[in-house]
Amino acid sequence: GITIPRNPGCPNSEDKNFPRTVMVNLNIHNRNTNTNPKRSSDYYNRSTSPWNLHRNEDPERYPSVIWEAKCRHLGCINADGNVDYHMNSVPIQQEILVLRREPPHCPNSFRLEKILVSVGCTCVTPIVHHVA
Amino acid sequence: GITIPRNPGCPNSEDKNFPRTVMVNLNIHNRNTNTNPKRSSDYYNRSTSPWNLHRNEDPERYPSVIWEAKCRHLGCINADGNVDYHMNSVPIQQEILVLRREPPHCPNSFRLEKILVSVGCTCVTPIVHHVA
């Protein structure tokens, strides 16, 4: 890893060991300076492996709302608009960090949590299982 | 929104307003109790819209390493294994939360930051722009 000299203006903390409790400013800075303003907005419908987005809400989590993708079919959509079951729709998943209120219902105390979310779907060639 | 009664055992905090500074335990809890144990491990290669994963490292960010997907082709792979430019490979993007050291180089003080990452690619039917 890269060692960075500590800034002398840092807030004081008792315990420098990991795991540790840190101070986090929840005033979110949005770094999305994306040169491609067209986002994945309609890809869910135009994809050969289309998906639907489901709202997952949990007031004990920050962010409280996360959108989960569910592939519409097990197969993929072909050029005729029909489902082709020689190909497979699969979810593209990503591990993301969220904040979980800990102790529960506390407005200003959290624990970092890793969750697996499905972001969309892609069409893949199936794995062929050869029978011995 | 859902109002939850505050737990009387919560740590004290000076400012209850948003934006606010909160305490976060960095001892990550992994909640991935997934009924689909098979993850997206090889989908990047088997997809009709294959992608490569690029390592994005930033020691001022937590997590410091994020993997970014970049679609290999503009078109999609057809049944013959060739690129079909009548279809488009597009990145599936997601906004995720990360922690940014603030002030810089501080080990225990962060600010929440939203960044846009490409998780994988999907094959979509192109938008046809009709010329008047």
């Epitope: 639907n52 489901h54 709202r55 997952n56 097990l74 197969g75 979810p91 199936p126 794995i127 | 009924t35």
Partner: antibody, heavy 124, light 113 residues
């Protein structure tokens, strides 16, 4: 608890359009998809189509040219329209909720809650 | 369309005895990505609408008694009732939820002898 209730005319004339409504309660419309299934008298079950949580639809190709499923979220109602009906469309029509399973990343096409069904007779 | 064939079509049973229904699919219902078989079982009691018993071949729906069990893979599936009770009478349907359109078997009528 979860409830689905079909309603609509019990008698439809041949060549006309069959219109049914399914009023639901006890579950979140944005999470669940709803299917329509029919059962001709003394026969088995036939899946007609589905409306997903985002309003998108998928139909059985046997009905594709004459079926429309829609939703009115403000009223918690789903509707089925089947045009150009014949005596062969006489059946009990059910609306049913498609199962929603957390941490499972595909839409489900099995149904975990059904309405009581409504008999529609096509006759002049 | 996928054809689902059930047997027997009629099954007279004795309370307390086991019962078994077979369902065969014209194509495999095993999805290679997650090794799940997309087969469900329903029971339609007399005068009622169908109720889900089992999905993914062997997963019991919440509230379904453990005397009901499902097994099989690919194209051949079985629903077993370990000890039939009087309330189990009705028509049992298998349904495949892999291929569109999602099709049902013709039904097996279970009645007390």
């Amino acid at each position: 608890q979860v409830q689905l209730q079909e309603s609509g005319p019990g008698l439809v004339k041949p060549s006309e359009t069959l219109s049914l409504t399914c009023t639901v309660s006890g579950f979140s419309l944005p999470s669940h998809s709803v299917s329509w299934i029919r059962q001709p008298p003394g026969k088995g079950l036939e899946w007609i189509g589905i409306i997903w949580n985002n309003g998108g639809t998928d139909y059985n190709s046997a009905f594709k040219s004459r079926v429309t499923i829609s939703v009115d979220t403000s009223k918690n109602q789903f509707s089925l329209k089947l045009s150009s009906v014949t005596a062969a469309d006489t059946a009990v029509y059910y609306c049913a909720r498609n199962a929603y399973i957390t941490d499972y990343y595909y839409e489900n096409y099995f149904m975990d809650a059904w309405g009581q069904g409504t008999l529609v007779t096509v006759s002049s | 369309d996928i054809v689902m064939t059930q047997s027997p079509l009629s099954l007279p049973v004795t309370p307390g005895e086991p019962a078994s229904i077979s369902c065969k699919s014209s194509q495999s219902l095993l999805f290679s990505e997650n090794q799940k078989n997309y087969l469900a079982w329903y029971l339609q009691k007399p005068g009622q609408s169908p109720q889900l018993l089992i999905y993914w071949t062997s997963t019991r729906q919440s509230g379904v008694p453990d005397r009901f069990s499902g097994s099989g893979s690919g194209t051949d599936f079985t629903l077993k009732i370990s000890r039939v009770e009087a309330e189990d009478v009705g028509v049992y349907y298998c349904q495949q939820s892999y291929y569109t359109p999602y099709t049902f078997g013709q039904g097996t009528k279970v009645e007390i002898k």
